[in-house]
């Protein structure tokens, strides 16, 4: 069976219909390039006006504007607010009332795209194998990204969240539209790594999103992480201003100045370091999210009423902080270098901030317990993996766990950690899962490239898809059209409970209260520390050029790994995806 | 200026099928999608699918889906829109209506014909 | 399907009066539009996208609104804008309201 033209709010799409075998028989009919809305520079995305005749819904349409990976030029383009549909059809009739998961893509709030990284038309984010294995449909969108998508002055002139509200069209689109595609537009579930995993946990507390989204799941990021809110906007909206030649002491005419400056000039006028600084990397992303006091009216952690009846899986994996660890301390992956304890020092201080000397000290002296007993290089490293690791992922992953449980009424709470090790070959033995090594497998790249992969591969993507998507069915990893391995316990406040996801994944699977020593740290003694300088999200560079930490480093910094250009390798690189 | 001019107006039995025409002028016949509304007597307006006159795609409402059946011809720039298993609460004005742009509202109404389903 | 729901259904008003009718949808939609039916006739286009006047409706019709709820008002009445008002939303399977007669008193 195949959809042919379908009717949209927009006028007719057609897309094509790809047979998954040569005898016939199932399908899947594949949309790209649908238009969700439009926008103007800096401007809140509005709804698209729509064409006559049928749309071609064929190629995938460019990325939205961004840096190149030198960061010395763009590609992309401002018109990007397109989407992609993967439809699975049996032989007979059409799909009718299919799940529907749509994917947010990561990449710091920075860069990405819907359709991900590519190798020889490979995508990464092609739903195919998601979309036939589970019997569900899948939608990628892009949304705008870096300044043009949350350039913010923190207040009405220049509100920022542009590229929140560009998810949020998106998902309003697939709500209004998708039953004609074969969809259940009320069960839609919105799924996403990294920047993406915190653009899902901030769709699920907007109040815009009231009835739209029925799950949700996270891998690798939070609402609540700390590089998922940008505290003081001001400073780097003025940093921009100033770079391109906008008035910085009015912040109407700076917007109005920057709302009409090149958005090419405004891309460019951000550089993201690389190399390292006085602060961790993470203090360096300026274009990320705002509290708005609209799309997202308060502190994350003060609405997670809007989540009580939204079921939720979030997890991490096991080294998440190692992409992060190697530009913070960069002798963290280099063999023949050594990490001192001045390094470690020097990071753990750079991300406690807030509760001053006294925070400093009583994280290095937690972490570093084990270096008595073992001060080998690899334990240290292992130790600087952790900390990143348990900082940027963990315990604000954790802490979203418990507050989503805790205001659940009919909602779900299951948390898993993706421990399948990185299969990049420069890694050091000891290298567990990298920030981004899970979303091959979910989007069942073992199976779509099974020469690049091992049996053992496929059996992690095979589970994982499995569990994706009968979550997405029913709310429940373990019940719908695919066999899982072993049950998935929900999380409970009492036990923890999570699901470690390796290569063979059996009872034993099921885990209680993952790293909870460094967990009661962070949520006890951490927190009741006293704060000596306000939020450490509001530490505000010096207004001058300099290079202290975190004002943007001059044009010709290094810069930090991004994903591959559109034809470039896809995503068992390392920093693939950035974070 | 633009013109939809539709035929005349039927009295058919139930079990029956009508096949009402609608003649489009005074603008190029394949650039707008074409809709169906139908309006039982002292009732609200009711949409029952839509046509693309230049490759004559169609979306029916779930409805009317199995008994509805529109088609063009664009030589004589006119869209057709058949009914079949006519039952007596068919019996409605049923009205063709042009896009006015884009995905915009149906800007251009024709003047209606009359279906009266009666044994 | 998303039901449009008008209030009131039936509305007296007098010429010069200030009407307002107000459609909600089920759920929130992309645009709404207003018709203008009288006795006999076929539908008139009367406000598209919430708020825009085709050429040739009088600046007395102005529409508002957005996402669930919208409105449509006539700022003083005249004898020829008793009717019948539907406002319609336009998504995949479009959907009118069931309409507002409007009366003279």
């Known amino acids: 069976a195949k959809l042919g033209a379908v009717y949209t709010e927009g006028g007719f799409v057609e897309g094509v219909n790809k047979k998954l075998s040569l005898l016939g028989g199932d399908s899947v009919d594949i949309f790209k390039g649908i238009p969700f809305a439009t926008a103007k520079t800096l401007e809140n995305p509005q709804r698209h006006p729509g064409w006559q005749g049928t749309l071609k819904a064929t190629n995938f349409k460019k990325r939205c504007l961004q840096a190149t990976i030198t960061q010395d030029n763009t590609y992309g383009q401002e018109d990007c607010l397109y989407l992609n549909i993967w439809v699975p059809q049996g032989r007979k009739q059409v799909s009718h009332n299919l799940p529907v998961m749509v994917w947010i893509y990561g990449g710091a709030f920075l860069m990405g795209s819907g359709q991900g990284a590519n190798f020889l038309k490979n995508y990464l984010y092609d739903g195919e194998e998601i979309a036939t294995r589970g019997n569900v449909i899948v939608v990628t969108f892009n949304y705008r990204v870096g300044p043009l998508g949350f350039l913010s002055t923190g207040d009405a002139n220049l509100p920022g969240n542009f590229g929140l509200r560009d998810q949020h069209m998106a998902i309003a689109w697939v709500k209004r539209n998708i039953a004609a595609f074969g969809g259940d537009p009320d069960n839609i579930t919105i799924f996403g790594e990294s920047a993406g995993a915190a653009s899902v946990s901030l769709q699920t507390l907007s109040p815009y999103n009231k009835g739209l989204i029925r799950r949700a799941i996270s891998q690798s990021g939070m609402a609540l992480s700390p590089w998922a809110i940008q505290k003081n906007p001001l400073f780097w909206a003025k940093t921009i201003a100033k770079k391109v030649g906008c008035p910085t002491e009015d912040t109407g005419k700076m917007a109005a100045c920057l709302k009409i400056t090149d958005p090419r000039a405004l891309t460019l006028a951000y550089k993201l370091p690389v190399k390292k600084q006085e602060y961790p990397v993470v203090h360096y992303l300026a274009f990320i999210p705002v509290i708005d006091g609209d799309f997202i009216p308060d502190d994350p952690i003060n609405l997670y009423n809007n989540t009580a009846d939204i079921d939720y899986i979030a997890g991490i994996n096991n080294m998440d902080g190692h992409l992060f660890a190697t530009i913070d301390v960069p002798a963290v992956d280099k063999t023949k270098q050594t990490v001192t304890e001045e390094d470690f020092y020097r990071l753990v201080s750079g991300h406690t901030v807030a509760k001053g000397l006294k925070g400093a000290q009583a994280t290095f002296d937690i972490y570093t317990e084990s270096w008595a007993q073992d001060p080998s290089q690899e334990n240290m490293k292992k130790t600087v993996v952790a900390f990143e690791t348990d900082v940027l992922f963990l315990i604000p992953t954790e802490i979203a766990l418990a507050q989503h449980k805790a205001h659940a009424k009919s909602a779900k709470t299951y948390s898993y950690l993706f421990s399948h090790p990185s299969r990049m070959p420069i890694y050091p033995k000891w290298m567990g899962a990298d920030h981004a090594d899970d979303l091959q497998y979910v989007f069942g790249k073992p199976f779509a490239t099974p020469l690049g992969y091992r049996p053992q591969d496929r059996a992690v993507s095979k589970a994982m898809i499995a569990y994706w998507t009968n979550f997405a069915r029913s709310g429940d990893p373990n019940m719908g059209n695919s066999p899982v391995p072993t049950h998935w316990y929900p999380y409970t406040l009492e036990n923890g409970n999570y699901l470690d996801i390796t290569k063979t994944i059996t009872s034993a699977s099921m885990k209680e209260h993952l790293r909870e020593k460094f967990l009661k740290f962070w949520a006890v003694t951490f927190e009741v520390l006293p704060t000596v300088t306000g939020d450490q999200d509001t530490l505000t560079p010096p207004e001058d050029d300099s290079e202290v930490a975190p004002d943007p480093p001059s044009d010709d910094s290094q810069v930090v790994p991004v994903p591959p250009t559109d034809d470039s390798v896809e995503a068992q690189m390392p920093a693939t995806i950035g974070f | 200026q633009v013109q939809l001019v539709q035929s005349g107006a039927e009295v058919k039995k139930p079990g029956a099928s009508v096949k009402v025409s609608c003649k489009a002028s005074?603008?190029?016949?394949?650039?707008?999608?074409m809709h169906w509304v139908r309006q039982a007597p002292g009732q609200g307006l009711e949409w029952m699918g839509v046509?693309?006159?230049?490759?004559?795609?169609?979306s029916y409402a779930q409805k009317f889906q199995g008994r509805v059946t529109m088609t063009r011809d664009t030589s004589t720039s006119t869209v057709y829109m058949e009914l079949s298993s006519l039952r007596s609460e068919d019996t409605a004005v049923y009205y063709c209506?042009?896009?006015?742009?884009?995905?915009?509202?149906?800007?251009?109404w024709g003047q209606g014909t009359l279906v009266t389903v009666s044994s | 399907d998303i039901q449009m729901t008008q209030s009131p259904s039936s509305l007296s008003a007098s010429v010069g009066d200030r009407v307002t009718i107000t459609c909600s949808a089920s759920q929130s939609i992309s645009y709404l539009n207003w018709y203008q039916q009288k006795p006999g006739k076929a539908p008139k286009l009367l406000i598209y996208?919430?708020?825009r006047l085709p050429s040739g409706v009088p600046s007395r019709f102005s529409g508002s609104g957005s996402g669930t709820d919208f409105t449509l008002t006539i700022s003083s009445l005249q004898p020829e804008d008793f009717a019948t008002y539907y406002c319609?939303?336009?998504?995949?399977?479009?959907?009118f309201g069931q309409g507002t007669k409007l009366e003279i008193k």
């Open positions: 996208a919430a708020s």
């Open positions: 319609h939303q336009r998504s995949s399977y479009p959907t």
């Open positions: 005074g603008y190029t016949f394949t650039s707008y999608n």
């Open positions: 209506a042009r896009d006015y742009y884009g995905s915009s509202p149906l800007g251009y």
């Open positions: 046509i693309n006159p230049s490759d004559g795609a169609t």
